[in-house]
């Protein structure tokens, strides 16, 4: 079965090939402590963030 | 050499509950996903759902939602998966599966056969 | 839900004869990251399944290569150049592209 949780991402090479996999459809990220998960929502918006983080780490030609 | 070896057969009362497992051995736990798997004549095969050990994390077939709850157990290499108030419905043989990326190797545990009847 | 179509339910082949098995899904499996996520497994008697083929047509080690998968976006076979006696058993195409994950029905490879 592909995994849902630890899907490989493929490295940033440039923003234009750059795609974002996350984990699909209705995902409990509750953990052994009983923590209650983050929403899909908020999964999607730190992944983002992330993205854009690493996008401006790129060096662009002059 | 990758293993997971499930529990034995289960003959439960319907409304009871019962915790099948799932030991693997042969590879770090916690490095790989387990998927488990329902098997019926009138259903065929269906996807229960995932746990992730390292982070507790589970996604569930909307469909065994309030039915299956996935556990793992990292100091023994384990997976659970809980089913409750049972009925004939739930009768079935129940597979592990390890994760993969959608391409390397493919294991399977051998199976649980649970009969739920009174 | 994805519906994956299995034809035929039954098959029944001779020795040395090529077989050839149907799946179908109700949406396209190309996913976003490019591959289709569509499988092949066998399950022989008694036994647990067996995964055969990934990504539509690349077999699993051990795996004869009289075994070929083919196929994209919802029209998908499996076929058996020479059909052996340890073939026999049921197969199921299965897709992990889309939540949640799914089955084909199966098709029982019987020899005649």
């Known amino acids: 079965m592909r995994n849902i949780f630890k899907r490989n991402q493929e490295p940033i090479v440039a923003p234009a090939t750059t795609t974002a996999t996350m984990p699909i459809g209705p995902v409990d990220n509750s953990t052994e402590s009983g923590g209650a998960g983050e929403s899909q929502e908020d999964m999607f918006a730190k992944l983002k963030e992330k993205l854009f983080n690493e996008i401006n780490k790129i060096p662009l030609p002059p | 050499e990758v293993q997971l070896q499930e529990s034995g057969a289960e003959l439960v009362r319907p409304g009871a509950s019962v915790k099948l497992s799932c030991k693997a051995s042969?590879?770090?736990?916690?490095?790989?996903?387990m998927h488990w798997v329902k098997q019926t004549p009138v259903h065929g095969l269906e996807w229960i759902g995932a746990?992730?050990?390292?982070?507790?994390?589970?996604a569930y077939n909307q469909k065994f939602k309030g039915k299956a709850t996935l556990t793992a157990d990292k100091s023994s290499s384990t997976a659970y998966m809980e089913l409750r108030s049972l009925t004939s419905e739930d009768s079935a043989v129940y597979y592990c599966t390890r994760g993969n990326d959608g391409y390397n190797e493919d294991y399977w545990g051998q199976g649980t056969t649970l009969t739920v009847s009174s | 839900d994805v519906l994956m179509t299995q034809t035929p339910l039954t098959l029944s082949v001779t020795i040395g004869q090529p077989a050839s098995i149907s799946c179908k899904s109700s949406q396209s499996l190309l996913d976003s990251d490019g591959k289709t996520y569509l499988n092949w497994l066998l399950q022989r008697p008694g036994q647990s399944p067996k995964r055969l083929i990934y990504?539509?047509?690349k077999l699993d080690s051990g795996v004869p290569d009289r075994f070929t998968g083919s196929g994209s976006g919802t029209d998908f076979t499996l076929k058996i150049s020479r059909v052996e006696a340890e073939d026999l058993g049921v197969y199921y195409c299965?897709?992990?592209?889309?939540?949640?994950?799914?089955f084909g029905g199966g098709t029982k490879l019987e020899i005649k």
């Open positions: 990504l539509v047509s």
């Open positions: 746990i992730d050990p390292e982070t507790g994390g589970t």
């Open positions: 299965w897709q992990d592209t889309h939540f949640p994950y799914t």
């Open positions: 042969g590879y770090t736990f916690t490095d790989y996903e």
